[in-house]
């Protein structure tokens, strides 16, 4: 029961996390114009991974995509890649985990298969979450670096005066969404990995099944063939089920419901 709950909760948390990663990737507010201690401008700028937007005080908003690949910073391209990898891995993880859920029965899928699938999806969620956290952190680092490099100046040029407004950009809402979403996906993945341990079937050993023949002198060979003297009913060599390697404890035969007397 606890395993099912852990697995189910892990799935839900990861689902919310991946939805958050997708939302963050699509959001326009990765960086927003820093208005603190800035000259008054007529607009408010904010940018996403795919386009930049300008909002006027009247509410009029204009967004424009980055119609270039080469003109963009390598760091931005890296962030895009990390977020997309995170989404893809997360989506595959979700797909795998749906079939791995203990509460969902698909044909005669064994618990061991479900355990493996749960572990696989868990690892995928962990990597997905790490990709999102890494992507957002790289972007945040880029913002911090650019923030302290920006300057403002004023000079007189041809045809009048020019003033460079100190346009600095700070953390946008998408960064916080990304960090939280990545964290949730990571937590969900860890929960799936924990659930996997509970799902893995404990080895039930019926390795030394004793067939008691009516003959007098019966030699018992654990795990191999039952050697008979030739007297009584057991004239054929009967193969005893052997699950594989045995520990010292398993050498002796334990009575079970399969014992025939």
């Amino acid at each position: 029961m606890a395993v099912t709950a852990c697995q189910g909760l892990g799935f839900v948390v990861s689902l919310i996390g991946i939805a958050g990663i997708i939302a963050a990737t699509c959001m326009d507010q990765w960086s927003t114009q820093d208005l603190y201690n800035n000259p008054v401008t007529a607009v408010f700028n904010y940018q996403g991974l795919w386009r930049s937007c300008v909002r006027e005080s009247s509410g009029f908003t204009e967004c424009r995509g980055y119609f270039t690949l080469l003109g963009l910073p390598a760091m931005l391209q890296a962030v895009r890649a990390l977020m997309i990898v995170g989404i893809v891995l997360g989506a595959i993880g979700l797909l795998v985990s749906i079939f791995a859920l203990k509460c969902i029965r698909i044909g005669s899928m064994e618990d061991s298969a479900k355990a493996n699938m749960t572990l696989t999806s868990g690892i995928m969620f962990i990597v997905s979450g790490l990709c999102a956290i890494a992507g957002v952190s790289v972007f945040a680092n880029m913002l911090v670096t650019n923030f302290w490099m920006s300057t403002a100046n004023m000079y007189t040029g041809m045809g009048g005066m020019v003033q460079t407004v100190q346009t600095r950009y700070t953390f946008g809402a998408a960064l916080f969404v990304g960090w939280v979403a990545g964290g949730l996906t990571l937590i969900g993945g860890v929960m799936m990995c924990i659930a996997c341990r509970g799902l893995a079937p404990e080895e039930t050993n019926y390795k030394a099944v004793s067939y008691h023949a009516s003959g007098h002198s019966v030699a018992y060979k654990p795990g191999g063939f039952k050697a008979s003297t030739g007297f009584g009913s057991n004239t054929k060599n009967k193969k005893i089920y052997d699950g594989g390697a045995r520990t010292e404890d398993e050498v002796q035969s334990y009575p079970s419901k399969h014992d025939y007397v």
Partner: nanobody, 122 residues
């Protein structure tokens, strides 16, 4: 760089009208705001009227109802229609624009023209 060229200034009688025009040329990028500032002798430069790309207008109190600003984004021009002129409107009128670069990490620049003289006198 953006170059702003004003025209339309001159001498006019009180109660008269003038139309100032300004043409922007060069790397105009996205012109967030276009408008007019003025500076009377011995006074600070003051904002007269501005118009954003979205069409929002802003006027100085003394100009509201008398002055009308308009802009043509296709031609990157801005005009100021001044009616019922008063002697206190006498000043050098400067064309102004706030421009920003497009694409990643937009930077904002303010540009002013060299000015055109408006004299209101009888």
């Amino acid at each position: 760089d953006v170059q702003l060229q004003e025209s339309g200034g001159g001498l006019v009688q009180p109660g008269g009208s003038l139309r100032l025009s300004c043409a922007a040329s060069g790397s105009t990028f996205r012109m967030n705001v276009m408008g007019w500032y003025r500076q009377a002798p011995g006074k600070q430069r003051e904002l007269v009227a501005t118009m954003t790309k979205g069409g929002s207008t802003n006027y100085i109190d003394s100009a509201r109802g008398r002055f009308t600003i308009s802009r043509d984004d296709a031609k990157t021009t801005v005009s100021l229609q001044m009616n019922s002129l008063k002697p206190e409107d006498t000043a050098v009128y400067y064309c102004y624009t706030e421009v920003q670069t497009t694409g990643w990490n937009p930077q904002i620049y303010n540009y002013w023209g060299q000015g055109t003289q408006v004299t209101v006198s009888s």
